[in-house]
């Protein structure tokens, strides 16, 4: 039994780091392997992660960690029984993948403006709380070409857009993801998407013209 692709890990900079690796053949990760991890300190306890399968030869382990400090460094030991397959180290602050934002909501009660709000995935005492920026993806369910990204570079987890920038009378979906420049993180996963019907009514002249144009088609 050998490691084909060495473990690579990312941290959510809060409580979980995720490590993935590939073995040289089909492996029952949870029964055959253990990933031990320990802070590089004299006294901290060694912790054991039981990996899960991630494809035939792939394994994934979710390492539970205490609050992350920027200087933290962990030793990683991958064991198959009494055999040490791989030894490495991991500094969470250098491999951050933020948590995905949540609670994405589209507020359509203001006639000409769409307000999208979501929740910051971190508590206020976490360093990333005040360092996240976001990308909001809006797309039409009817038209694959109607796909747009809005970059939100301010701290407030919200986006206002004019309803008129989207087509009227059709359904749209939105999702949001986050990253933090301070730690040069990767993008988070996308949040679950939310759906709404864009029922913006254009001013009469435009609406009449639009209707007339549509009638010609």
């Amino acid at each position: 039994m050998k490691v084909l692709q060495e473990p690579t890990c990312v941290s959510d900079y809060m409580s979980i780091s995720t490590c993935e690796w590939k073995m040289n053949g089909p492996t029952n990760c949870s029964t055959e392997l253990r990933l031990l991890y320990q802070l590089v300190f004299l006294l901290s306890e060694a912790h054991t992660c039981i990996p899960e399968n991630n494809g035939g030869a792939g394994c994934v382990c979710h390492l539970l960690m205490d609050d992350v400090v920027s200087a933290d460094n962990y030793t990683l030991d991958l064991w198959a029984g009494q055999q040490l397959l791989w030894k490495g180290s991991f500094k969470p602050s250098e491999h951050v993948k933020p948590r995905a934002p949540g609670n994405l909501t589209v507020h359509t009660n203001v006639s000409d403006t769409l307000l999208l709000t979501w929740s910051n995935p971190y508590p206020p005492d976490n360093y990333l709380y005040n360092h996240l920026t976001y990308a909001v993806n809006i797309w039409s369910e009817n038209d694959p070409a109607d796909f747009r990204i809005y970059n939100v570079t301010y701290l407030e987890p919200s986006l206002r857009i004019a309803a008129s920038t989207l087509k009227s009378g059709i359904s749209y979906r939105a999702r949001v993801r986050a990253w933090a420049q301070c730690y040069n993180t990767t993008w988070s996963e996308w949040s679950p998407s939310t759906k709404w019907h864009n029922s913006y009514r254009e001013p009469f002249e435009q609406h009449h013209h639009h209707h007339h144009h549509h009638h010609h088609h």
């Epitope: 802070l39 300190f41 004299l42 006294l43 901290s44 306890e45 205490d66 400090v69 005492d125």
Partner: antibody
Framework: EVQLVESGGGLVQPGGSLRLSCAAS????????MSWVRQSPDKRLEWVST????????SYPDSVKGRFTISRDNAKNTLYLQMRSLRAEDTAVYYC????????????WGQGTLVTVSS | DIQMTQSPSSLSASVGDRVTITCRTS??????LAWYQQKPGKAPKFLVY???TLAEGVPSRFSGSGSGTDFTLTISSLQPEDFATYYC??????????FGQGTKVEIK
């Protein structure tokens, strides 16, 4: 419930020896690093010694190095501090403390045992 | 060795007051700092670790902040049971641990 109970303190003459014990219960003693910390009459706290979970690694400040020895018996759930060549400035309440699971902060402390070095 | 300087060494306050204790270190210790509370005749009690994370069971009126060399312990509304001596302690770069000299919080 985590409990740490120190014993072995008392009055000793300068140059004398004493062995302190700390009986641990309520947690898996063999998986935790342990430490001794003392508090002098002026209420200052001073770290005295540290030992890792299996007893294979120890450390001391210069003030006690070569005179104090920390050890543990995981089968008996007991931590020890052997003190030799005691000096007046070693007079203090001696606490044993457990290290926090993830960090090298001390999350549980015993009630302490008083060591008085005087002629 | 890393030096720890706590201030003030003592303070007088009333129940309900907001109390702030500071701890300064001689070199960068990131967030490797703990706070302890000690009442007369008792052992120190673990309050805060990682400079800002409350230990289990510690009331939310306690909060820690800071990183690098400057740290603060705040009690938002002092309660009768909070009158005690508070110590900071670093745990960066073991195998050495250093405590601050303590701050005694007394009743005004």
């Amino acid at each position: 419930e985590v409990q740490l109970v120190e014993s072995g303190g008392g009055l000793v003459q300068p140059g004398g020896s004493l062995r302190l014990s700390c009986a641990a219960s309520g947690f898996t003693f063999s998986t935790y690093g342990m430490s001794w910390v003392r508090q002098s009459p002026d209420k200052r706290l001073e770290w005295v010694s540290t030992i890792n979970s299996n007893g294979g690694s120890t450390s001391y400040p210069d003030s006690v190095k070569g005179r104090f020895t920390i050890s543990r018996d995981n089968a008996k759930n007991t931590l020890y501090l052997q003190m030799r060549s005691l000096r007046a400035e070693d007079t203090a309440v001696y606490y044993c403390a457990r290290f926090f699971r993830f960090r090298n902060a001390m999350d549980y402390w015993g009630q302490g045992t008083l060591v008085t070095v005087s002629s | 060795d890393i030096q720890m300087t706590q201030s003030p060494s003592s303070l007088s306050a009333s129940v309900g007051d907001r109390v702030t204790i500071t701890c300064r270190t001689s070199e960068n210790i990131y967030s490797y700092l703990a706070w302890y509370q000690q009442k007369p005749g008792k052992a120190p009690k673990f309050l805060v670790y990682n400079a800002k994370t409350l230990a289990e069971g510690v009331p939310s009126r306690f909060s820690g902040s800071g990183s690098g060399t400057d740290f603060t312990l705040t009690i938002s509304s002092l309660q009768p049971e909070d009158f005690a001596t508070y110590y900071c302690q670093h745990y960066y770069g073991p195998p050495t641990w250093t405590f601050g000299q303590g701050t005694k919080v007394e009743i005004k």
